[in-house]
């Protein structure tokens, strides 16, 4: 398993919530992305391809998420100080092979200014 700090802006704040950006290489066709808070799985999203190149998106731990061709964004709302923690994007690449797991992350700091406009 490869571990490292995200070398991009992982946290994007808006309206009392945060978008956590988990990037993956654009060559990746099938994968599972998990968002970890400390060691706890908060969210996951799995993209697989079936016969005829039909794309299937599944989520065992559902969060509001957004998929693009090189990233998964997970959205957390109603931020408070308890959200401050290390967050990790745990990427398991199934296709193309070989199977590979990468873990990248960063610390989410919560400041008063980010709590002002709560999204209800």
């Amino acid at each position: 398993e490869i571990n490292g700090s995200a070398n991009y802006e992982m946290f994007i704040f808006h309206n009392g919530g945060v978008q956590i950006l988990c990037k993956y290489p654009d060559i990746v066709q099938q994968f599972k992305m998990q968002l970890l808070k400390g060691g706890q799985i908060l969210c996951d999203l799995t993209k697989t391809k079936g016969s005829g190149n039909t794309v299937s998106i599944k989520s065992l731990k559902f969060c509001h998420s957004q998929l693009s061709n090189n990233s998964v964004s997970f959205f957390l709302y109603n931020l408070d100080h308890s959200h401050a923690n290390y967050y990790f994007c745990n990427l398991s690449i199934f296709d193309p092979p070989p199977f590979k797991v990468t873990l990248t992350g960063g610390y989410l700091h919560i400041y008063e200014s980010q709590l002002c406009c709560q999204l209800k």
């Epitope: 490869i2 290489p25 654009d26 060559i27 193309p96 092979p97 070989p98 199977f99 590979k100 990468t102």
Partner: antibody, heavy 121, light 107 residues
Framework: QVTLRESGPALVKPTQTLTLTCTFS??????????VSWIRQPPGKALEWLAL???????FYSTSLKTRLTISKDTSKNQVVLTMTNMDPVDTATYYC?????????????WGQGTTVTVSS | DIQMTQSPSSLSASVGDRVTITCRAS??????LAWYQQKPEKAPKSLIY???SLQSGVPSRFSGSGSGTDFTLTISSLQPEDFATYYC?????????FGGGTKVEIK
């Protein structure tokens, strides 16, 4: 045209560290999906995979040799370097580097000609 | 680690024979298997990737089949230049692993 060429010492002494360089052309290790791997073959024996480095600098090693191996890349020079510590006569082998291009599923599609390393005092 | 077991370890055959080499993985590897040919004092050459796809420039007498754990390399009509050692290799997961090789000798 894709080519790879291995270079390094022909003879090393036991306990020394071996440094091998793979110089390649025809592709770039900064291209998404590209990887370079090292493989060795002792005289009269089977191929043994050693290590691989990929485009985003992730590194993978043989389970039995990982404590002795380090792989690195210099993208600007089109080179991959493998170091192997604490060499022993059983490490006498021909060492190959090979390209693997993951998004095309080709396996180790192009190999260097190999460099022979003898470990002896 | 995934173990790759090849059989037989050697075989004798004549020009024109149909030759079959098998490779078994210790766990499922989908179709992520490659076959290589190696002649004495030469580097291996890639023959087949993704279990059944022929590398560019490889003669059509070579074919591969299988998925999961059991795979086969077939040479439909053995030619003099085909006498060599053949290796399978999985690239489903790290560490990558090779089979022990099959030496095809002249009968």
């Amino acid at each position: 045209q894709v080519t790879l060429r291995e270079s390094g010492p022909a003879l090393v002494k036991p306990t020394q560290t071996l440094t091998l360089t793979c110089t390649f052309s025809g592709f770039s290790l900064s291209t998404s999906g590209m990887c370079v791997s090292w493989i060795r073959q002792p005289p009269g024996k089977a191929l043994e995979w050693l290590a691989l480095i990929d485009w985003d600098d992730d590194k993978f090693y043989s389970t039995s040799l990982k404590t002795r191996l380090t792989i690195s890349k210099d993208t600007s020079k089109n080179q991959v370097v493998l170091t192997m510590t604490n060499m022993d006569p059983v490490d006498t082998a021909t060492y190959y580097c090979a390209r693997m291009s993951t998004p095309t599923y080709y396996g180790l599609d192009v190999w260097g000609q190999g460099t022979t390393v003898t470990v002896s005092s | 680690d995934i173990q790759m077991t090849q059989s037989p370890s050697s075989l004798s055959a004549s020009v024109g024979d149909r030759v079959t080499i098998t490779c078994r993985a210790s766990q499922g590897i989908s179709s992520w298997l490659a076959w290589y040919q190696q002649k004495p004092e030469k580097a291996p050459k890639s023959l087949i990737y993704a279990a059944s796809s022929l590398q560019s420039g490889v003669p059509s007498r070579f074919s591969g089949s299988g998925s999961g754990t059991d795979f086969t390399l077939t040479i439909s009509s053995l030619q003099p230049e085909d006498f060599a050692t053949y290796y399978c290799q999985q690239y489903n997961s790290y560490p990558l692993t090779f089979g022990g090789g099959t030496k095809v000798e002249i009968k």
